[in-house]
């Protein structure tokens, strides 16, 4: 397969929908940034399709994406992060579709990690803590976090709490006694940078104590 498109192929290609979406991750690997793009139509034939970004780059005019199955990505330090870049889908030397995108508006933070829940017997509450790599970053430092929890038996009944810190207190009386809960957290840029929710952290599971009949309080586990 030569990678060249014959005229017929190009005519066919123009009938296809080459809509794509991208997200950036800043300082994802040391001072390296990443940009990931994918076609919105999972059935598009990507055999000879390549992505290229031009403009708003440091020292270079354009960069080519690498392809990993259906995903196209760049890992680089060369994003200027000022102004818009032109991201194009190409076949051979022909651009099929392009988008002008400011990479600071499509930021997807890294998922939070080290989520844990500690029961405080004296305070009758649960302290939820988690960590985020963004505390150490130069660019995307300020995030809004979405903590979601549910009783394990309630498959789609999630309760969401938005917060800007990495610590949350859940009052024991707001939770069912002697129940297993699942909790998880994700993040979104909240200052200057715009974009998308991160992936969810791995879930953490905890059990609420039984109710102590004499005092009406829950027993710690």
């Amino acid at each position: 397969e030569s990678g060249y498109a014959q005229n017929g192929d190009l005519e066919d290609a123009e009938l296809d929908d080459y809509s794509f979406s991208c997200y950036s991750q800043l300082e994802v690997n040391g001072s390296q940034h990443s940009l990931t793009c994918a076609f919105e139509d999972p059935d598009v034939n990507i055999t000879n399709l390549e992505f290229e970004i031009c403009g708003a780059l440091v020292e270079v005019k354009c960069l080519n994406f690498r392809k990993l199955q259906e995903i196209y990505f760049i890992e680089t330090k060369k994003f200027l992060l000022i102004g818009k870049s032109n991201i194009c889908v190409k076949v051979g030397e022909k651009s099929l579709t392009c988008k002008k995108i400011d990479l600071t508006t499509i930021v997807k933070p890294e998922a939070p990690f080290d989520l844990s829940v500690v029961y405080r017997e004296g305070a009758n509450d649960f302290v939820v803590t988690f960590n985020t790599s963004h505390l150490q970053k130069k660019y995307v430092k300020v995030l809004m976090h979405d903590v979601a929890y549910r009783q394990e038996k309630d498959e789609n009944k999630w309760t969401h709490v938005n917060l800007s810190s990495t610590k949350l207190t859940l009052l024991q009386r707001k939770l069912q006694p002697a129940a297993m809960y699942e909790i998880k957290v994700r993040s979104i840029p909240d200052h200057y940078f715009k974009g998308f929710w991160s992936e969810w952290s791995p879930s953490y599971y905890f059990r609420t104590p039984e109710i102590n009949n004499s005092s009406g309080e829950m027993d710690p586990i």
Partner: antibody
């Protein structure tokens, strides 16, 4: 203007270690890019040996991996090549060059230094 | 490893001729290809990167085309200073590999 300059002994004995240094001027090796070593045996084509990335990580060609070490001295803005257990097959012109990884080119090259492996 | 098959290995041409050199990758490499010119006793010089883009300071008689597996370097009108050896190189996957070279000689 970015400039690279190789230096090191021109003659190495078989089984010994070949050591070369590339001195970079006009650009810091810790700012960006991969910093590469490439070699060219007499009358033959080019072979990529490996690189040290601006972050300090290294990547080597599998055929030489067991014998190659690329390191750097950031205070001198230099990076170095060590190739152990050399044989006559390692006789070549050795070049250092900038590029690769996120860009698809080597844009700046040293002038090359000839290394002969002989007893 | 990705093999880069360059052809021809040598060619004779005259000043003013149009010269075409091809490079065939053993698997698809997108646009991750560069072309270099090397003169005897000198380091290679970058001519084309990203398969089709002309490097800074390189005369416009040099052009690159192709993507995927098949690539071409064209010199539209050969000049005396163009007699040299030309190499393609892929950066798509490790180890980065070069073609065997094409020596362009005076007819």
């Amino acid at each position: 203007q970015v400039q690279l300059q190789e230096s090191g002994p021109g003659l190495v004995k078989p089984s010994e270690t070949l050591s070369l240094t590339c001195t970079v001027s006009g650009y810091s090796v810790t700012t960006d890019y991969a910093w590469n070593w490439i070699r060219q045996p007499p009358g033959k084509g080019l072979e990529w040996i490996g690189y040290i990335f601006y972050s300090g990580s290294t990547t080597y060609t599998p055929s030489l991996k067991s014998r190659v070490t690329i390191s750097r001295d950031t205070s001198k803005n230099q990076f170095s090549l060590k190739l152990s257990s050399v044989t006559a097959a390692d006789t070549a012109v050795y070049y250092c060059a900038r590029g690769g990884y996120d860009v698809n080119y080597f844009d700046y090259w040293g002038q090359g230094t000839t290394v002969t492996v002989s007893s | 490893d990705i093999q880069m098959l360059q052809s021809p290995s040598s060619l004779s041409a005259s000043v003013g001729d149009r010269v075409t050199i091809t490079c065939l990758a053993s698997q698809t490499i997108g646009y991750w290809l560069a072309w270099y010119q090397q003169k005897p006793g000198k380091a290679p010089k970058l001519l084309i990167y990203a398969a089709t883009r002309l490097a800074d300071g390189v005369p416009s008689r040099f052009s690159g085309s192709g993507s995927g597996t098949m690539f071409t370097l064209t010199i539209s009108s050969l000049q005396p200073e163009d007699f040299a050896t030309y190499y393609c190189q892929q950066f798509f996957s490790y180890p980065w590999t070069f073609g065997g070279g094409t020596k362009v000689e005076i007819k």
